[in-house]
């Protein structure tokens, strides 16, 4: 969840006090403290919405809030891929789209979000209580996961609102570039603040909220995002998981049922690890298949950002899973 | 190093069935699904289906639905393709692949004649 | 079914010599959502399987030499080998990567002179 660190309305300085100076050395530690916060910490949201005219039917759509290219996204249902879940689509940005049934169609709607529109019937429909997953795999954040699913009460038509992350997992949260940067720009912001510490204070009103208390608690977990980190995963309700998972693609109109590849499980007890190999806790950053997502040992695609700097263990490679499957 | 090591050419009759395989190694299995693609002689590729090796999913073109049933053995990494009631317009060259076809096997080649 | 219409279906060229190979597929392979095209190129030798070159129309995959370029968009696509090889005699196909079932076109043979 975004932790939005809580900025002081600081009076603007008295003329002669600190002059314009003085005005950018308060501003700019906050600036920075609110980048500290909230950087590294994107967000993903899901959204399931039953069709009035299909009551087998549901629509999931699932975006990401970060600043970082995604490099793959999977969508999962019956709960996080690796716990448990069933893959029913991989996307890949450019590589393509993997769809198994009950999925119908898979299709990105902006560069951050997609939509998946599931239908069947009998035991390879979803229902109600199902719970879905997407996992985002972005450079440089990591891999984050949210999982959503319709309130018992929804009436069809309604969608639930977009859940953020209920379960997020940031397999990394945040890779050396951006978090380069970003150590820069907090080790100098405790530099100032050290600084200022040192100087007579300036002239606040009195009522203001020092900069040690924003501070605290700007680094303190919201309890929103703690309670997130201790949800546990939903229960399953097995009869909606499918019980075929054979499809075949029509002549007709271009079909998008296909398999997909899964992914690496997620460990229920620890950040999931994007590949299967076995990597240090919380540095499983997926390599896609080539591309963005430096697969194992392989470059990165000319056009993406290099991700030849946080290797995966398996070589170049390791990214390409699901599409691969993972 | 990512391997996919395909079973020998096939000689066999009309009517009858052939199952090939396509061993995989240098990376987890079921981390990845596995395509099947024929290729005619002297024709261009077809894509056949996938399957994804964690639950056995699969997926078809529509063209050969009825001709092959794809399955994965998961203890030895190996991914099957059976086609039946076999024809001469089933002679050809069948590869696996995996997801997204940047890994190819080496191709089987299966002769069907009386 | 997306029909991929591959042209020529071969020409001669001297080593050093830039070669264009053209790709049209019978509906667009954009994706209006994230506005990528989903184009596979792939080279054939003789007696080997396929390689793939190039993914999302432009991308090239790790280890092709930067004298393969893929360019298009929507339903006509370009490879372009800036300075041919004698090793870059072969086979080269399209593949539609955006809807299934996949589907390729029928080939490009190069030869060199």
């Known amino acids: 969840m975004r932790t939005e660190a809580q900025v002081p309305a600081l009076q603007p300085p008295e003329p002669g006090l600190e002059g314009a100076m003085g005005h950018r050395t308060l501003v700019l530690p906050w600036v920075l403290l609110t980048l500290c916060v909230t950087a590294g910490t994107p967000e993903v949201w899901v959204q399931v919405r039953m069709e009035a005219t299909e009551l087998s039917s549901f629509t999931i759509r699932c975006g990401f809030l970060g600043s970082g290219s995604i490099s793959l996204v999977t969508v999962s249902w019956g709960g996080p891929n690796g716990a448990g879940g069933t893959t029913l689509a991989v996307l890949h940005p450019e590589r393509g789209i993997r769809q198994w049934a009950p999925a119908r169609q898979a299709r990105w709607e902006t560069q951050s979000s997609i939509s998946l529109i599931l239908e069947g019937s009998g035991a390879s429909s979803p229902c109600a209580n199902t719970t879905f997953c997407c996992k985002f795999a972005s450079f440089p954040e990591g891999s984050w996961e949210a999982c959503g699913s319709l309130p018992p009460s929804s009436d069809p038509g309604l969608s639930a609102p977009p859940t953020p992350a209920p379960i997020l997992r940031a397999d990394l949260a945040g890779i050396l570039g951006v978090s380069g940067v970003l150590l820069f720009g907090c080790v100098y912001l405790l530099h100032l603040l050290r600084r200022h510490k040192h100087r007579p204070a300036p002239r606040l009103q009195p009522s203001r909220t020092s900069p040690q208390a924003p501070r605290a608690r700007a680094w303190a977990p919201s309890q929103a995002s703690q309670a997130a980190l201790h949800v546990p995963y939903a229960t399953i309700n097995t009869s909606c998981r499918p019980a075929t998972l054979d499809t075949a693609h029509p002549h007709g109109g271009p079909s998008w049922w296909a398999s997909l590849p899964t992914h690496a499980a997620h460990r229920p007890q620890g950040p999931a690890a994007w590949a299967s190999t076995p990597i240090p806790a919380r540095g499983s950053f997926v390599s896609v298949e080539n591309g963005l997502y430096a697969q194992a040992g392989e470059r990165p695609p000319h056009t993406g950002p290099g991700l030849t700097l946080f290797p995966d263990p398996r070589g170049p490679r390791a990214m390409e899973g699901p599409l691969g499957v993972r | 190093e990512v391997q996919l090591q395909q079973s020998g050419p096939e000689l066999v009759k009309p009517g009858a069935s052939v199952k090939i395989s396509c061993k995989a190694s240098?990376?987890?299995?079921?981390?990845?699904?596995m395509n099947w693609v024929k290729q005619s002689h002297g024709k261009s590729l077809e894509w056949i289906g996938d399957?994804?090796?964690?639950?056995?999913?699969?997926s078809y073109n529509q063209k050969f639905k009825g001709k092959a049933t794809l399955t994965v053995d998961k203890s030895s990494s190996t991914a099957y393709m059976e086609l039946r009631s076999l024809t001469s317009e089933d002679s050809a060259v069948y590869y696996c692949?995996?997801?997204?076809?940047?890994?190819w096997g080496q191709g089987t080649l299966v002769t069907v004649s009386a | 079914d997306i029909v991929m219409t591959q042209s020529p279906s071969s020409l001669s060229v001297s080593a050093g010599e830039k070669v264009t190979l053209s790709c049209k597929s019978s509906?667009?392979?954009?994706?209006?959502?994230?506005?990528?095209?989903?184009l596979a190129w792939y080279q054939q030798k003789p007696g080997q399987p396929p390689k793939l070159l190039i993914y999302?129309?432009?991308t090239r995959e790790s280890g092709v030499p930067d004298r393969f370029t893929g360019s298009g968009s929507g339903t006509d696509f370009t490879l372009t080998i800036s300075s041919v090889q004698a090793e870059d005699l072969a086979l080269y196909y399209c593949?539609?990567?955006?809807?299934?079932?996949?589907?390729f076109g029928s080939g490009t043979k190069l030869d060199i002179k």
């Open positions: 240098g990376y987890t299995f079921t981390d990845y699904s």
């Open positions: 593949q539609n990567a955006h809807s299934y079932p996949f589907t």
């Open positions: 399957i994804n090796p964690n639950n056995g999913g699969t």
């Open positions: 509906q667009s392979l954009l994706n209006s959502g994230n506005q990528k095209n989903y």
């Open positions: 692949a995996r997801v997204w076809f940047a890994y």
């Open positions: 999302g129309a432009s």
